[in-house]
């Protein structure tokens, strides 16, 4: 099939990507699976411009992104290089805090109420954002 030229219904197009913003919460792994079932991935933030776009749509609400360090180093779910890529952590974050009493540290990244990032317990039921590149959004042409 041909490349898609528009985003699915209820998704928002921005800079050749399609974004879906949840209005309910899930744990990070469940949100990740949700995006995968949509042929997408948790949002990968690669620029200040993309950060501002996402921040505008989610508002001041804790929201998962596709960044985690569950296997050691911080990794983006789509393979984007973390070390050389865009970052927007809150001061003194990530801190892998153990003081929450839930067991373990903090291995999943989310947007905080001011848009900057924090690491948190992956089981917390936060909202999330899915992203898919426009030319990967479907193998179908747009409906006429």
């Amino acid at each position: 099939g041909s490349e898609r030229t528009c985003c699915p219904v209820n998704w928002v197009e921005h800079e050749r990507s399609c974004y879906w913003f949840s209005r309910s919460g899930k744990a990070w792994a469940d949100a990740d699976n949700y995006c995968r079932l949509e042929d997408a991935h948790l949002v990968v933030v690669t620029s200040w411009e993309e950060q501002k776009f996402v921040q505008h749509h989610i508002g001041p609400v804790n929201t998962w992104m596709g960044l985690h360090d569950q296997n050691g180093p911080w990794k983006w779910v789509d393979g984007t290089d973390y070390e050389t890529g865009f970052k927007n952590w809150r001061p003194e974050q990530p801190d892998d805090w153990y003081g929450h009493g839930l067991g373990g540290g903090e291995d999943c990244a989310h947007f905080t109420d001011d848009g900057r990032w924090n690491d948190d317990v992956c089981q917390r039921p936060y909202r999330w954002v899915c992203e898919t590149e426009l030319d990967k959004a479907s193998q179908e042409p747009p409906l006429l």
Epitope: G1, S24, K26, D30, R36, L37, E38, D39, Q139, E140
Partner: antibody, heavy 118, light 107 residues
């Protein structure tokens, strides 16, 4: 009108294989994830598997993982469930379902009966 | 896996009655809950999704409520066509799981 029509069920011996099909119409098939759900005689519903619209991501219940494979042919608007190493406890009516908004199972086929018995 | 426990397993009621069915999740599923109706020999039919949203074409006498772990399906005034089995489903986490069902039968 959304229509889902399962086929391929029947009687098979333990250890045998069967391939179920689900022909879909009335919606843009490739844009929707799809699921298989089964119901043993007189029992409740059990989710079996799900597959994303382009087929790149699949999910399975532990009870069928490694034995069942879900796939799809978007050019033919058809969903498949390849069932291997079948057991008596796999006996059930198998339904295919369309995953709609937020992945809710909004349309179901009428089901096909799979009986695993010697 | 998340277990979904429905109660009662059956309820006897008359046309016009208000019927309430409950579903309890073994862990927090926020609002990722659906309700289905199934009649003998038929496929399940989606009634309610996201805990309280009414599926298109479903009569307004059906309503859903709850959050977290405790959920309710209410039929405000039972109609003859409502005698069936009702079950809940969570889609918060894989594997998606269903309740065992509540049969609404004629008193």
């Amino acid at each position: 009108e959304v229509q889902l029509l399962e086929s391929g069920g029947g009687l098979v011996q333990p250890g045998g294989s069967l391939r179920l099909s689900c022909a879909a119409s009335g919606f843009t098939f490739s844009r929707n994830a799809m699921s298989w759900v089964r119901q043993a005689p007189g029992m409740g519903l059990e989710w079996v598997s799900a597959i994303s619209g382009r087929g790149g991501n699949t999910f399975y219940a532990d009870s069928v993982k490694g034995r069942f494979t879900v796939s799809r042919d978007n050019s033919k608007n058809t969903l498949f469930l390849q069932m291997n190493s079948l057991r008596a406890e796999d006996t059930a009516v198998y339904y295919c379902a369309k995953n709609g908004r937020e992945q809710w199972l909004d349309y179901w086929g009428q089901g096909t009966l799979v009986t695993v018995s010697s | 896996d998340i277990q979904m426990t429905q109660s009662p397993s059956s309820v006897s009621a008359s046309v016009g009655d208000r019927v309430t069915i409950t579903c309890r999740a073994s862990q927090n599923i926020t609002n990722w809950l659906a309700w289905f109706q199934q009649k003998p020999g038929r496929a399940p039919k989606l009634l309610i999704y996201t805990t309280s949203s009414l599926q298109s074409g479903v009569p307004s006498r059906f309503s859903g409520s709850g959050s977290g772990t405790d959920f309710t399906l209410t039929i405000s005034s039972l109609q003859p066509e409502d005698f069936a089995t009702y079950c809940c489903q969570q889609t918060n986490s894989f594997p998606w799981t269903f309740g065992h069902g509540t049969k609404v039968e004629v008193k």
